[in-house]
Interface confidence: low
């Protein structure tokens, strides 16, 4: 396996817009929370129009999604809203702003202001405090990975309406404590804190208390500090594959980076009957080109109606700013029955595709752009 | 937190081979690697090889070809270099560090053991 | 191979000092550069990967430049604790991971 070695790219490859330099902001909400994400313009100046996207698909308004162009909320999150967050410039699809939102169960990250656990006077005459929501603190342990914001909540109500404080470790907690301070909501019985780093790890206690009465409840958190890493590429099996003529061949490789990968499928291809250039490096032409906006992502490269021409040597390619990571996939094609003699020794395993074929349309390529000529790809379509 | 602890010192005559191992804790081993780094008394650092703890797979410096060998066990979350055929220009101090790939080296090392100086003498 | 050239190869300066250490490399190698600090007897220590990123831990003085192959670190104002041999690694063709020569940081 070649390893962040330079390629000579043939053909005309589309430039993908890349991410602006800065690192993807991880939010973790709880469900039912309102997600909230803001993108300032950058440098303060005009924004221009924007879209906003989720894994790589445009938000549609709705009752629940907000959409403005700085400002997306998502109300009444649940797990399905989970994903990478993207709001880019409508033109150039630049992106402007990335987040990873996680919806969990309570306690949640993140700092919504939805004000649903508001003091409110619930009609008793007195009586000693008691939790509103007990099925949102049923998470004792959160570990999030460094620089998230962490939301701890114990909703709670009481006659009179209960003071709330916080202990780190046992002891009082101020915002003095940690650098970057801390957010106390009373109303909404919250502990903020914006950017977790590992000192912030430890016991955190709501007490909860009237003149009738006290109640307490204790989180932990964990903080995980992240390892920078280039991308991890899992190749999908099999990854050699022998083909009839006319049938469509699928290669997948799952890319696993914290960062936002770079991820190309290329083709090792012959110019004037070389392999390589003068300075040794292969010749390559780029079949797909674009950047992953999700920590996991599932790529597939999808030929239909192979030719012989289509044989040979396909990578599977991921670049973050830490490094370069590919896989290798080969492919044979034969004519009807050169695969049919052997077809019972590759069906076991399972590197035969001969299924029927498939016309894909303009519309099953999701509109993206053709990065190498249509002469040079003539039938081969892309999911 | 995460902790690499090497072997102890080791004398060796040349010709004789000789394994070091690393013990990793405080993260998941098989999801990255190990690489392996020497520095001869007063010299620069150079890379031995590195080993993916996940599949096993091996990437050895070309220099070391043949006599170097890598291996781990995650029963124990130790990680092993054996170098055989010792010579005396093979005196130095021997380093694990963490490599945060399981995939492919290159990473940068962020975790390092404390060394372990191997002196090859007759 | 890459090789990785670092200058200079001593160095002496005083407490509250800036200091800079280049590194040059072969060939392109992106931003794929990170530099460690090695105090005697003890094991390197990452400061800075892919080039210009702090490694969490590490104090504010210490910042990184440079993509291609020219790459720079910089020390904005020498402490005690900062005498030690620097060196440069690229992790943008492996293998072999190469490194430099080191730079080695002595007080004035």
């Known amino acids: 396996e070649s390893l962040g070695t330079e390629q000579r790219v043939v053909g005309r490859a589309a430039e993908v817009p890349g991410p602006e330099p800065g690192q993807q902001e991880q939010l973790v909400f709880g469900s039912g929370d309102a997600v909230e994400l803001s993108c300032p313009p950058p440098g303060g100046g005009p924004m221009g129009p924007t879209v906003w996207v989720k894994d790589g698909t445009g938000l549609v308004p709705s009752e629940r999604v907000l959409v403005g162009p700085q400002r997306l909320q998502v109300l009444n999150a649940s797990h399905e809203d989970s994903g990478a967050y993207s709001c880019r410039q409508r033109l150039t699809q630049r992106v402007l702003c990335h987040f990873s939102v996680r919806v969990t169960d309570a306690p949640s990250s993140g700092d919504d202001e939805d004000g649903e656990d508001e003091a409110e006077d619930t009609g008793v005459d007195t009586g000693a405090p008691y939790w509103t929501r007990p099925e949102r603190m049923d998470k004792k342990l959160l570990a999030v990975p460094a620089a998230n914001t962490v939301r701890f909540r114990c909703p709670a109500a009481g006659n009179p309406t209960p003071s709330i404080s916080w202990l780190k470790n046992g002891r009082e907690f101020r915002g003095e404590h940690r650098i970057g301070g801390i957010k106390l909501r009373h109303q909404q019985w919250s502990l903020v804190m914006e950017s977790v780093v590992p000192s912030d790890r430890g016991n955190y206690t709501c007490v909860v208390e009237n003149k009738f009465g006290s109640i307490r409840q204790t989180y932990t958190l964990d903080v995980l500090e992240r390892s920078p890493h280039r991308p991890i590429l899992q190749a999908g099996l099999p990854a050699n594959q022998t083909a009839v003529l006319g049938s469509d061949v699928e290669f997948h490789c799952k890319v696993y980076s914290d960062a936002q990968p770079h991820i190309q499928w290329l083709k090792h291809v012959e110019v004037n009957g070389s392999k390589v250039g003068p300075d040794g490096t292969p010749y390559v032409t780029v079949l797909k080109s674009w950047i992953s906006e999700s920590v996991e992502a599932d790529v597939r490269l999808r030929l239909a109606n192979v030719s012989e021409r289509d044989g040979g040597e396909y990578l599977c390619r991921a670049t973050n700013f830490i490094g370069v990571a590919e896989k290798a996939f080969w492919l044979s094609v034969h004519g009807p029955r050169a695969a049919e003699e052997e077809l019972v020794e590759a069906d076991e395993a399972g590197s035969v595709y001969a299924g029927e074929q498939k016309l894909i349309s303009e519309e099953d390529l999701g509109g993206e752009q053709k990065l190498i000529s249509e002469e040079d790809l003539h039938h081969h379509h892309h999911h | 937190q995460v902790q690499l602890v090497q072997s102890g010192v080791e004398v060796k005559k040349p010709g004789a081979s000789v394994k070091v191992s690393c013990k990793a804790s405080g993260y998941t081993f098989k999801f990255y690697g190990i690489s392996w780094v020497r520095q001869a008394p007063g010299q620069g650092l150079e890379w031995m090889g590195w080993?993916?703890?996940?599949?096993?797979?091996?990437k050895y410096a070309q220099k070391l070809q043949g006599r170097v060998t890598m291996t781990t066990d995650t029963s124990t979350s130790t990680a092993y270099m054996e170098l055989r055929s010792l010579r005396s220009d093979d005196t130095a101090v021997y380093f694990c560090?963490?490599?945060?790939?399981?995939?492919?080296?290159?990473?940068?090392?962020?975790?390092w053991g404390q060394g372990t100086l191997v002196t090859v003498s007759s | 191979d890459i090789q990785m050239t670092q200058s200079p190869s001593s160095l002496s300066a005083s407490v509250g000092d800036r200091v800079t250490i280049t590194c040059r490399a072969s060939?392109?190698?992106?931003?794929?550069l990170n530099w460690y600090q090695q105090k005697p007897g003890k094991a390197p220590k990452l400061l800075i990967y892919a080039a210009s990123s702090l490694q969490s831990g590490v104090p504010s003085r210490f910042s990184g430049s440079g993509s291609g192959t020219d790459f720079t670190l910089t020390i904005s104002s020498l402490q005690p604790e900062d005498f030690a041999t620097y060196y440069c690694q690229q992790s943008y063709s492996t293998p072999p991971i190469t490194f430099g020569q080191g730079t080695r940081l002595e007080i004035k």
């Open positions: 080993i993916s703890v996940y599949n096993g797979k091996t």
């Open positions: 560090a963490r490599d945060g790939d399981y995939e492919s080296s290159g990473y940068p090392f962020d975790y």
């Open positions: 060939q392109s190698i992106s931003s794929y």
